[in-house]
């Protein structure tokens, strides 16, 4: 059964023609898979800093290091992509700073798909100097773990030399890699010592070994490919918003709710109200009134503006956001002061946001 009773029918239809939601665009930090990333929390005078990723508390682990105002991610993978926040808790208030991390490598193995520089990897030897295969550009082979989003193109390279010119073949998980082993096959560019797989899928995960050999020897190098799938997620609300506020009778006030959602979000502003002198219905559920929701007649739905407030407007205001996957909500309190008291913006240390996960 519903966890509240609505005072009035709040049908959400018809909905406005939706637009792609891009609210409160935070700073973006980009890293390639395998790289390390260090971000400094850009908040001043922080006594205690806590970190979240996609609304979930972030603690230290073998790849995540939290030291003071610094967050370090070692050996980043696309799974590390997301919306991060650092919250500085001080004695009198708290503040949150948001940033995005995007770990992606559309063309893997550190160079452009066109391989414009590839010819230099094809080393010509003096015919008299017989030589076993050797690597000519180990820098392009340093990154062994390639974590790539599904549908991207991956390139593995093993630039080599030798005399006579070595041949190159590829193994997947230690066995001969055949074209029929993947839908769409793959490309081998011998002159660039590269293997290219387009539009990777989870079944492409595994170890890929280049074997470079001639009659004088054989060398090999193994890459590990992880194909990371994105999945839609529930809305994420910026921690600490909406913020508690106070104003005098007759004053104006604004509550702001910042939303991160890749599926179309539906935003509602809800207030606890009384009906017939009671805050709760016969079923014991609180009476709630929808003050505003994203729809045809609704302007900027992330902002709830209250004008010429009265004492009756005091209370808890809930920002509730839903997409087809799930929900999130957070609330703030409005304090309405008598006219003789000067209004002040009230910032309190906020507890962990009420994510519904």
């Amino acid at each position: 059964r519903p966890s509240f009773s609505l005072v009035e029918d709040t049908t959400l239809e018809p909905e406005e023609p939706p637009t792609k939601y891009q609210i409160s665009q935070p700073e973006v930090y980009v890293a390639a898979p395998g790289e390390s990333l260090e971000v400094r929390c850009l908040l001043k005078d922080a006594a205690v800093i806590s970190w979240t990723k996609d609304g979930v508390h972030l603690g230290p682990n073998n790849r995540t290091v939290l030291i003071g105002e610094y967050l370090q991610i070692k050996g980043a993978t696309p799974r590390d992509s997301g919306l991060y926040a650092c919250t500085a808790s001080r004695t009198v208030d708290s503040e949150t700073w948001y940033f995005m991390v995007n770990v992606t490598d559309a063309i893997s193995s550190g160079d452009d798909e066109d391989d414009t520089d590839g010819a230099e990897d094809f080393v010509s030897e003096n015919s008299n100097n017989k030589r076993a295969p050797y690597w000519t550009n180990t820098e392009k082979m340093e990154k062994r773990l390639h974590a790539v989003p599904a549908a991207n193109t991956v390139k593995f390279r093993c630039p080599a030399g030798g005399n006579p010119m070595p041949t190159m073949r590829w193994l997947k998980n230690g066995k001969e890699f055949k074209q029929e082993h993947r839908i769409g096959g793959y490309k081998v560019r011998n002159q660039h010592w590269s293997l290219i797989m387009e539009s990777v899928v989870p079944s492409d995960k595994g170890n890929y070994t280049c074997v470079v050999e001639n009659e004088y020897g054989s060398i090999n190098h193994t890459y590990h490919l992880d194909v990371v799938e994105r999945s839609p997620h529930r809305p994420i609300l910026q921690a600490g918003l909406p913020a508690n506020a106070s104003t005098v009778v007759g004053g104006d006030v604004e509550f702001v709710c910042k939303v991160y959602s890749d599926a179309q979000p539906h935003i509602q502003w809800i207030k606890h109200v009384e009906k017939n002198g009671s805050k709760y219905g016969p079923d014991g559920l609180p009476y709630l009134k929808v003050l505003k929701h994203s729809g045809i007649n609704s302007s900027n739905a992330e902002v709830l503006a209250l004008f010429n407030v009265t004492e009756a407007d005091a209370g808890e205001y809930i920002c509730k956001v839903s997409n087809y996957i799930g929900q999130a909500n957070q609330s703030a309190w409005l304090t309405v002061l008598p006219k003789q008291q000067a209004p002040g913006r009230e910032k309190e240390i906020t507890a962990s946001p009420d994510y519904l996960e």
Partner: antibody, heavy 113, light 106 residues
């Protein structure tokens, strides 16, 4: 492994009600909307409504409002769809689905006098 | 309610063919999902958020589009791809589906 397992086929008379269950396993039932979609024989898919198990929030397709009731029992991770005042054109396969990528196997409801 | 109109309603094609199905919305949308359904089975998600491949879906399926016009493309038809395909919008209540495109073997 995520599974949505629905109750078995039902045969009902016009004017009666039917209640279909959908038991979820392999994921956190309360964290995702449970949608109900139906498909009449040889026809397309039609969204009926959805329930958010954590708090019981419901969104209905206005076409079914007043006839469909969505409920859930979080203690057994099960959602229910009840359709009342059945008519012959309610004969269909009824599916529960969550996140768009988890689907039940479907429950066939036949309305016949 | 936002109406979704798929074209064509039915289509005959051969293994190896490239096939495109379009979905036109009566109002602008942010995203589109695409499903495949075989007789007697539940729909299977192929594409979400217009262009993202769902888990376990072969890379020969792709989605694109924006606003009112969206497309599902199968780059090289395989025998198991003969089925009915539906577009769906999750953006605006009530959520709606296209009428379906039946893909048959030529």
């Amino acid at each position: 492994e995520v599974q949505l397992v629905q109750s078995g086929a039902e045969v009902k008379k016009p004017g009666a009600s039917v209640k279909v269950s959908c038991k979820a396993s392999g994921y956190t039932f309360t964290n995702y909307w449970m949608h109900w979609v139906r498909q009449a024989p040889g026809q397309g898919l039609e969204w009926m409504g959805a329930i958010y198990p954590e708090n019981g929030d419901i969104n209905y397709n206005q076409k079914f409002k007043g006839r469909v009731t969505l409920t859930r029992d979080t203690s057994i991770s099960t959602a229910y769809m009840e359709l009342s005042r059945l008519r012959s054109d309610d004969t269909a396969v009824y599916y529960c689905t969550s996140r768009g990528d988890y689907w039940g196997q479907g429950t066939t409801v036949t309305v016949s006098s | 309610a936002i109406q979704l109109t798929q074209s064509p309603s039915s289509l005959s094609a051969s293994v190896g063919d490239r096939v495109t199905i379009t979905c036109s919305a009566s109002s602008g949308l942010s995203y589109m999902s695409w499903y495949q359904q075989k007789p007697g089975k539940a729909p299977k998600l192929l594409i979400y958020d217009t262009s993202n491949l769902a888990s376990g879906v072969p890379s020969r399926f792709s989605g694109s589009g924006s606003g009112t016009d969206f497309t599902l493309t199968i780059s090289s038809l395989q025998p198991e791809d003969f089925a009915t395909y539906y577009c769906q919008q999750w953006s605006s209540y009530p959520y709606t589906f296209g009428q379906g495109t039946k893909l048959e073997i030529k």
